[in-house]
């Protein structure tokens, strides 16, 4: 979509084990009300309140890992748009299904 990005980043995914998987609530931030973002959660994809990022435009060191395989989803959601939206040393990289925050590989 041509819309500008919503502020903040998705909250970190809880490490709890999922007992019941939920059908996805959204496919992009723009299908979420207000400031909420479309985010991966323990048991599916939900509209969640974002958390702030200190410097969203900063590029982080390292390279994005190469991804293999084909995404079976039409218009997969992006869970980030730039490195600064990712926690710690994680980078915003294109994966098999949309962009997400992943550990970089050494350049």
């Amino acid at each position: 979509s041509g819309k500008s990005f919503k502020a903040g980043v998705c909250p970190p995914k809880k490490s709890a084990q999922c007992l019941r998987y939920k059908k996805p609530e959204c496919q992009s931030d723009w299908q979420c009300p207000g400031k909420k973002r479309c985010c991966p959660d323990t048991c599916g994809i939900k509209c969640l309140d974002p958390v702030d990022t200190p410097n969203p435009t900063r590029r982080k060191p390292g390279k994005c890992p190469v991804t293999y395989g084909q995404c079976l989803m039409l218009n997969p959601p992006n869970f980030c748009e730039m490195d600064g939206q990712c926690k710690r040393d994680l980078k915003c990289c294109m994966g098999m299904c949309g962009k997400s925050c992943v550990s970089p590989v050494k350049a």
Partner: antibody, heavy 122, light 108 residues
Amino acid sequence: QVQLQESGPGLVKPSQTLSLTCTVSGVSISSGGYYWSWIRQHPGKGLEWIGYIYYSGSTYYNPSLKSRVTISVDTSKNQFSLKLSSVTAADTAVFYCAREGEYYDEGGFDYWGQGTLVTVSS
Amino acid sequence: EIVMTQSPATLSVSPGERATLSCRASQSVSSNLAWYQQKPGQAPRLLIYGASTRATGIPARFSGSGSGTEFTLTISSLQSEDFAVYYCQQYNNWPPWTFGQGTKVEIK
């Protein structure tokens, strides 16, 4: 018991916006636990899922219709609505509203409205 | 999107006989498959979900089986009220949810 009832104009002119409302009784949309869908059936044809909305207002649309579809919810009236823009004769169909559980193990659409025929014609 | 293909398009069966309807998915949908019955001028009615679980109030003569890409709906002994169109629908992984084109069960 749970009931869904579609309402809206039965005739829409080409290039205009089709607007339908589904009124739900017997269960509160705002209590959560369900996705509320719109599904259409072209005359003498099969079924096409348009999209769904959650009580919070989050939506998921069929990519084939995404650019023209808006689904909204009014929990105070226990209603959800469909808007389909830039309609053509190919959008003539019976439109159903339906309910499905939010979890995969709850399966398909367990309650449906009776359907309303919308004809696109000048 | 996942394409659902039903066969046959029309099934002619005598009352009291068994009817077997098939549904094939273009890729695996696990057990996330539902079956519906639709009569003329009516909305579809949920018969089976999770590929094999009967919905509330559905008679035991309706049964579903299969997983992955191949599914079957069996009506063990057709009653007069069972003559209708039957649709399968997948709800696996990501929307869009998709339906088969339908199988019409008619009186032989």
